[in-house]
């Protein structure tokens, strides 16, 4: 099941997705799409990076973090109820069934009516930003920060693959952070 994130109408929504490049500048193509991840690529692409830069984006969708360091989290500006739904972050690691795909559910709530004008907090600031993997080897576990609306049972252990070796090529299709290299 998808990890759920929430935002109010008019706020910016933040959908986290990360990977760790094997070396600085050694980027992996990433696509973001509206709708669950299909078998290949992303459907209804809203943003895409290649091995150098962001090469496609649509209005209101942008990367706020440093994508050159693997922070490919999506920010959706000034959300409306129509922005609710599943979003796909696909980290397109080359190799047979080597890519990683993450489905994130965005729930948009109507804006709260407040009696007095107050400074509205940006949605992005409400979310801790990192979900990292630690260790090395097939029994690697994840270290979680405080992530709102995440049920821990939804996050399974990620195998830190010896990618491109003749060893384990076992992909765990969950969580939203991977290490490459």
């Amino acid at each position: 099941s998808e990890v759920e994130y929430r935002a109010e109408v008019g706020q910016n929504a933040y959908l986290p997705c990360f990977y760790t490049p094997a070396a600085p500048g050694n980027l992996v193509p990433v696509c973001w799409g509206k709708g669950a991840c299909p078998v290949f690529e992303c459907g209804n692409v809203v943003l895409r990076t290649d091995e150098r830069d962001v090469n496609y984006w649509t209005s209101r969708y942008w990367l706020n973090g440093d994508f050159r360091k693997g922070d490919v989290s999506l920010t959706i500006e000034n959300v409306t109820l129509a922005d609710s739904g599943i979003y796909c972050c696909r980290i397109q690691i080359p190799g047979i069934m080597n890519d990683e795909k993450f489905n994130l559910k965005l729930v948009i709530k109507p804006a709260k009516v407040t009696p007095a004008p107050t400074r509205q907090r940006d949605f992005t600031a409400a979310f801790p930003r990192m979900l990292t993997t630690r260790g090395h080897g097939p029994a690697e576990t994840q270290t979680l920060g405080s992530l709102p609306d995440i049920n821990l049972t939804q996050i399974s252990t990620l195998a830190n693959e010896l990618r491109d070796s003749r060893l384990a090529n076992d992909l765990r299709d969950s969580g939203a952070t991977i290490r490459i290299g």
């Epitope: 190799g95 047979i96 069934m97 693959e161 491109d164």
Partner: antibody, heavy 117, light 113 residues
Framework: EVQLVESGGGLVQPGGSLRLSCAAS????????MSWVRQVPGKGLEWISG????????DYVEPIEGRFTISRDNAKNTLYLQMNSLKSEDTAVYYC??????????WGQGTQVTVSS | DIVMTQSPSSVTASVGEKVTINCKSS????????????LNWYQQRPGQPPRLLIY???TQESGIPDRFSGSGSTTDFTLTISSVQPEDAAVYYC?????????FGSGTRLEIK
Amino acid sequence: EVQLVESGGGLVQPGGSLRLSCAASGFTFDDYTMSWVRQVPGKGLEWISGISGNGGRTDYVEPIEGRFTISRDNAKNTLYLQMNSLKSEDTAVYYCAKTSPQSLDYWGQGTQVTVSS
Amino acid sequence: DIVMTQSPSSVTASVGEKVTINCKSSQSVVSGSNQKSYLNWYQQRPGQPPRLLIYYASTQESGIPDRFSGSGSTTDFTLTISSVQPEDAAVYYCQQAYSAPYNFGSGTRLEIK
């Protein structure tokens, strides 16, 4: 020595079903993604499906998605392909292949599937 | 999808001759993260399953004779058989393993005179 032995092929009518099996030996089966590749007689090769080592991820090409199901039993070192709603264009030799991220490094001998009325 | 185009479709050679088979991908199959080309070569003898010869464009699979070598990068790749032997009569396929679907070339048939 790596060995992959497919079975379960045969003649089936359009709309029918078959279940292919691939018995693996000579390597740690659950460490590896496994794939099915098919070859229409006299034609080229087509990767059609793959399954990760723990079975947690499965991928299919569009022509078979929703009709074929790949699965594995790691306790039995066996890979499966359940083929439903078969069409004449599914007629081919079906190979299972041990899969590394960069290649299909070992292949079985193949099993013939013929879909005909 | 990445389309793989092989040439020639067939080639005839005498024992001891050098043979080159070409493969072109419709887009780059080089990984930015490890700088490797996700391009494979397979040999399929009559009545046999395919056998991996070369992966990463130029890395020879274990047990493959040294007369088989691969070269190239980005989108243009070559399989070279330095001195053809009778047992090399087969169809040779390239395949990209960069992104799904992992398409194969249409094959090059090698016949021995």
